[in-house]
């Protein structure tokens, strides 16, 4: 008998075609050869089974000898044998109907678990394979599972349930729910104002939840709550803000933080964290600050930076147009009775400029002059 | 919801062929079938025939047998129809429709944004 | 094939207006018939199938009916977006035939 597969909820079309291409009667039945549908002339009549409402026909293939049966909006117990009885002839179909969900929401944080469960009929033995965005392959029976979700990970899954050599193929969208970057560097010379931007990388109708910016100094021996806030529909509203220092937030995403000034006191890290609601856990995004400053006093031009630099920056002191004074893998370098002229700082890595300050030194009898 | 996306206007020659494609979105390729239907400008409309897009089984219009073809690619949700030996009078709006049967009939349920077809020398 | 000949072929009122469009088949089709609306530039759309029942989301103005030969689409009362063409299609047999189209203008 011929094996048919069908998705929970979709429609199914069984065909069941007679030797003569012309209207004559026909019936569909079960296995329990109760009557579903059939005709009466050009009329559909319909039997006493379980599909009433949801079976259909396709009159107009009649008049070709074809007699479909349609079931709509399937639900896995309508696995069954179809008979379909025509010409005193009985062809039979098979129906299996099996159904993919996602055990919990389709939309998840960053780190959690996905599970596929495979809903089949009794008797049936299927294989599942589904195929995530990124091209990975995850293989099983009745449940699958993936753990530690990545932002790669969002998109369309595809999975292929197969029985009898056939097989029926699901889509399941899922969002990951994550910040744009895990982490982020801002470099900024003192003085200048800081903007932390915190996109997100999944866009959903309402957004609702709250969030906390907790940063730790290099200075300091204890991290602190520097804000808090509410997100509600996307909007935001700053719940608690620190006064030193004063941060600004902006009131619709992406998340958007103004330091008004950049000072090394300010200088480390901090961590973003975003309680969704209706979501257990939290989305992580880490942001460091960098800062530097020029200074000369009397005899000596000094150039710092504080905050998290990697070990292969590089600190250079030099006089503009110049080869570097001074260039070292540390957090200061200075220069001990500088030339008259604009000097220049720069933070890099592998000769890129990450940050760059410029100060004036003036003939020794004059001040120094900050640009 | 249903979407039916089909492909932009298209201007041909006389003798030539035209592909139009109708991509579906926001329902699975399966239980209805895809129905072509034109309309020549200032006209009415002309039924011209159904692909299964599960299946792939065809029906035509009597009047087009032999110059239309309806295929379809189950990977995209994609249904093609492709008219050959173009005349002027082909020159229309041509759209995909997906059916809906209700008690043993098709309608015509969702419609594609239709695409012009204009055959000129 | 079944002709479907509406009547009128076209026709003006006012917003408020009841209005009723015919469409008579060359054989008999049940009620196995369907009106579709549509305004320039854009694709039909269904209203009224097997005869008499509305298309979901299509407003309780619109009413159909009709059975074997002869059909009836009427608009109890115009609304403004109301004025478009309508067609009837016959379901029954291939090949699928469409009246040549009433359009409802404004008066």
């Known amino acids: 008998k011929k094996v048919v597969l069908g998705k929970k909820g979709d429609t199914v079309e069984l065909t069941c075609t007679a030797s003569q291409k012309k209207s004559i009667q026909f019936h569909w039945k079960n296995s329990n050869q109760i009557k579903i549908l059939g005709n009466q002339g050009s009329f559909l009549t319909k039997g006493p089974s379980k599909l009433n409402d949801r079976a259909d026909s396709r009159r107009s293939l009649w008049d070709q000898g074809n007699f479909p049966l349609i079931i709509k909006n399937l639900k896995i117990e309508d696995s069954d044998t179809y008979i379909c009885e025509v010409e005193d002839q009985k062809e039979e179909v098979q129906l299996l109907v099996f159904g993919l969900t996602a055990n919990s929401d389709t939309h998840l944080l960053q780190g959690q678990s996905l599970t596929l469960t495979l809903e089949s009929p009794p008797g049936s033995s299927p294989s599942v394979q589904c195929r995530s965005p990124r091209g990975k392959n995850i293989q099983g029976g009745k449940t699958l599972s993936v753990s530690q979700l990545e932002l790669q990970d969002s998109g369309t899954w595809t999975c292929t349930v197969l029985q009898n050599q056939k097989k029926v193929e699901f889509k399941i969208d899922i969002v990951v729910l994550a910040f744009q970057k895990a982490s982020s560097i801002v470099y900024k010379k003192e003085g200048e104002q800081v903007e932390f931007s915190f996109p997100l990388a999944f866009t959903v109708e309402k957004l609702t939840g709250s969030g906390e910016l907790w940063w730790q100094a290099e200075r300091a021996s204890s991290s602190k709550s520097w804000i808090t806030f509410d997100l509600k529909n996307k909007e935001v509203s700053v719940k608690r803000v620190t006064q030193d220092p004063k941060l600004q937030m902006g009131k619709k995403l992406p998340l958007h933080l103004t330091l008004p000034q950049a000072l090394p006191q300010y200088a480390g890290s901090g961590n973003l964290t975003l309680a969704l609601e209706a979501k257990t856990g939290k989305l992580h995004q880490e942001v460091n600050l960098v800062v530097m400053r020029a200074t000369q006093l009397q005899k000596n031009l000094t150039c710092e930076v504080w905050g998290p630099t990697s070990p292969k920056l590089m600190l250079s002191l030099k006089l503009e147009n110049k080869e570097a004074k001074v260039s070292k893998r540390e957090k200061a370098v200075w220069v001990l009775n500088p030339e008259a002229g604009m000097w220049q700082c720069l933070l890099s890595d592998s000769g890129q400029v990450l940050l760059e300050s410029n100060i004036k030194v003036l003939p020794t009898w004059s001040t120094p002059v900050q640009p | 919801q249903v979407q039916l996306v089909q492909s932009g206007a298209e201007v041909k020659k006389p003798g030539a062929s035209v592909k139009v494609s109708c991509k579906a979105s926001g329902s699975t390729f399966s239980g209805y079938y895809m129905h072509w239907v034109r309309q020549a400008p200032g006209q009415g409309l002309e039924w011209m025939g159904w692909i299964d897009p599960n299946g792939g089984g065809t029906q035509y219009a009597q009047k087009f047998q032999g110059r239309v073809t309806m295929t379809r690619d189950t990977s995209t949700s994609t249904v093609y129809m492709e008219l050959s030996s173009l005349r002027s009078e082909d020159t229309a709006v041509y759209y995909c429709?997906?059916?809906?049967?209700?008690?043993?009939?098709?309608?015509?349920?969702?419609w594609g944004q239709g695409t012009l077809v204009t055959v000129s020398s | 094939d079944i002709q479907m000949t509406q009547s009128p072929s076209s026709l003006s009122a006012s917003v408020g207006d009841r209005v009723t469009i015919t469409c008579r088949a060359s054989?008999?089709?049940?009620?196995?018939l369907a009106w579709y609306q549509q305004k320039p530039g854009k694709a039909p759309k269904l209203l009224i199938y097997?005869?008499?029942s509305l298309q979901s989301g299509v407003p309780s103005r619109f009413s159909g009916s009709g059975s074997g030969t002869d059909f009836t689409l009427t608009i109890s009362s115009l609304q403004p977006e109301d004025f478009a063409t309508y067609y009837c299609q016959q379901a029954n047999s291939f090949p699928f035939t469409f009246g040549q189209g009433t359009k409802l203008e404004i008066k």
């Open positions: 097997e005869a008499s």
């Open positions: 429709a997906k059916d809906i049967v209700h008690d043993g009939t098709e309608y015509f349920q969702h």
């Open positions: 054989q008999n089709v049940n009620t196995w």
